[in-house]
């Protein structure tokens, strides 16, 4: 009786205290079994006395449901635990990634600092280079100017013949003969002078191309500048230079820069010519015209601007031409060849 029950109870309590909390215990089927057996012992000894069989069945059903619920709860718990484990794993991964990113950020920050240092150093260098560049630009401009002057000086004894038809077989002698023909056909006064001394004569560019629509120019290099100047003067006086009756042009052979400078006088030259100021472009690119009975010379547009400020009529006449931007479409000089 009592001792037995107590003993069992004690055993039972021992079992309970020694075992883990209910939730954990419920996960072990062996424990469940022993717990039910104890209950049945109690029922055998005392239960039948106190209640009838139906009560016992109800109780068993209730217990069964409880067990079911318990199992369901247990499953949910297991799922939650699994999910939590998964989340933990992901969190750990994120933590690792975060650590890596932190490291990367740290290295990027240090690299940015280094770059900033380098950029500021480069800025200093650039400023220095800019200063040097300005000096260099000035030097280059000076060099270009002197190169242009040298080039013009080298080309000074040269005459450019434009529009002279090309023949299949051409050599120095043939071209020299062509020049002789031009002189004989157009410039009797020069023709009667002593033999024209030529240092060199050639087509330019030197390579012949059958695809060219117009004949290549002929460059004549005289031994004396005077001869070139005499020919240009004679061409200017004659007005129309021909070879076999067909018009050709004679010009000074100038550097590209000087040619551009001459071209820039175009609109002004044409206006002055129209109004009978007798304009001329003299070597290398000076504009001259007759004003107030005198020949006035102008090296550049600014010089002309300064000149016209005190001459309202001339200022009005050249107003537009003088305000044209350098890169405007310059009209070619009329009879520019005869300059």
């Amino acid at each position: 009786g009592m001792g037995k029950k107590q003993n069992r109870k004690t055993g039972n309590s021992k079992t309970q205290s020694a075992s883990p909390p209910p939730k954990e215990r419920s996960s072990s089927p062996a424990t469940e079994q022993s717990w039910m057996e104890n209950d049945f012992d109690e029922l055998r000894e005392e239960g039948f006395r106190r209640s009838n069989y139906s009560e016992l069945r109800e109780d068993i059903q209730t217990k069964g449901k409880e067990v079911e619920n318990f199992e369901k709860n247990l499953e949910e718990c297991i799922t939650r635990i699994t999910n939590t484990e998964k989340c933990l794993k992901e969190l750990m991964e994120l933590k690792t990634k975060a650590r890596e990113l932190r490291e990367e950020c740290r290295s990027l920050r240090s690299r940015c600092d280094q770059l900033e240092e380098r950029v500021s150093a480069m800025e200093d260098e650039m400023n220095e280079m800019k200063r040097e560049g300005k000096f260099r630009e000035k030097r280059i401009k000076r060099n270009e100017q002197s190169l242009q002057e040298i080039w013009d000086y080298v080309k000074r004894p040269n005459l450019r013949l434009i529009g002279v038809p090309e023949s299949d077989v051409e050599n120095g002698t043939k071209l020299e003969n062509t020049l002789q023909d031009i002189i004989q056909e157009n410039f009797p006064n020069l023709a009667r002078q002593a033999n024209v001394q030529i240092q060199e004569i050639q087509r330019t560019p030197q390579r012949y191309s059958s695809r060219r629509a117009t004949p290549r120019h002929i460059i004549v290099r005289f031994t004396k500048v005077e001869m070139k100047e005499k020919m240009l003067r004679a061409a200017r006086e004659k007005g129309r230079v021909t070879l076999k009756g067909k018009p050709i042009r004679l010009t000074a052979d100038l550097s590209a820069e000087t040619l551009q400078a001459r071209r820039e006088w175009g609109p002004i030259f044409n206006i002055l010519k129209e109004k009978n100021f007798q304009p001329r472009i003299s070597y290398p690119a000076k504009l001259s015209f007759i004003s107030e009975g005198e020949i006035k010379y102008f090296i550049d547009k600014q010089m002309l601007r300064d000149f016209v400020t005190t001459r309202p009529a001339l200022k009005e006449l050249l107003k537009e031409a003088l305000n044209m931007e350098r890169n405007n479409r310059y009209q070619p000089l009329q009879n520019h060849a005869k300059m």
């Epitope: 002698t173 043939k174 003969n177 004989q184 023709a191 009667r192 033999n195 009756g245 067909k246």
Partner: antibody, heavy 121, light 110 residues
Framework: QSLEESGGDLVKPGASLTLTCTAS????????MYWVRQAPGKGLESIAC???????TYYATWAKGRFTISKTSSTTVTLQMTSLTAADTATYFC????????????????WGPGTLVTVSS | AYDMTQTPASVSEPVGGTVTIKCQAS??????LAWYQQKPGQRPKLLIY???YLASGAPSRFKGSGSGTEFTLTISGVQCDDAATYYC????????????FGGGTEVVVK
């Protein structure tokens, strides 16, 4: 291609005469046209030439002032002669001279048969 | 002036012989020299142009040479038909009308 002179005649000293050279089969512009004369038993003597394209003319020293060469049409060149003397008696040839730069290098590659001018009282 | 001096004024050569006529320019005329043959009562006929080129219709026994100021006309294997007066002409300066032609060389074939 041919040249034909005309206008040759027997004239009195002091008279004037105009000779005409007619070209056919070529453009005068591509050549220098000459008048050349030859007195009986003498050599060839150039009188004057004309660049028909530009109108530039040249004369022998002795011909200046008395002789005038000109292009009167696209096919004719004339030689006007004034104050003629017995010394001007000769056969007058019209000749075509190539340009110096041409392959014929300034030679006379076409001649007329000549026209006779006699100056006699 | 480009004075043209022709030598000799006259030359006599048997058939089959060689005749040499010289022409000298007072200044260089490059290769701008021509030779002409003229028979009595006829117009001059172009033989040689550009100093050494044989004109079409001219016999190959005629040969031109020289450049600058000295020029030569050579007739090799002279034939009776070659009896004529020969003139040199400078083709460089048309402005020098006075000195267009040399004085001429009469060739007599024996």
């Amino acid at each position: 291609q041919s040249l034909e002179e005309s206008g040759g005649d027997l004239v009195k000293p002091g008279a004037s005469l105009t000779l005409t050279c007619t070209a056919s089969g070529f453009s005068l512009n591509n050549y220098v046209m000459y008048w050349v004369r030859q007195a009986p038993g003498k050599g060839l003597e150039s009188i004057a030439c004309i660049y028909t394209g530009s109108g530039t003319t040249y004369y022998a020293t002795w011909a200046k002032g008395r002789f005038t060469i000109s292009k009167t049409s696209s096919t004719t060149v004339t030689l006007q002669m004034t104050s003629l003397t017995a010394a001007d008696t000769a056969t007058y040839f019209c000749a075509r001279r190539t340009y110096t730069s041409d392959s014929y290098a300034g030679s006379f590659n076409l001649w007329g048969p000549g026209t006779l001018v006699t100056v006699s009282s | 002036a480009y004075d043209m001096t022709q030598t000799p004024a006259s030359v006599s050569e048997p058939v089959g012989g060689t005749v040499t006529i010289k022409c000298q320019a007072s200044q260089s005329i490059g290769s701008n020299l021509a030779w002409y043959q003229q028979k009595p009562g006829q117009r001059p006929k172009l033989l040689i142009y550009a100093a050494s080129y044989l004109a079409s219709g001219a016999p190959s026994r005629f040969k031109g040479s020289g450049s600058g100021t000295e020029f030569t006309l050579t007739i090799s294997g002279v034939q009776c038909d070659d009896a004529a007066t020969y003139y040199c002409q400078q083709g460089w300066s048309s402005s020098d009308v006075d000195s267009t032609f040399g004085g001429g060389t009469e060739v007599v074939v024996k």
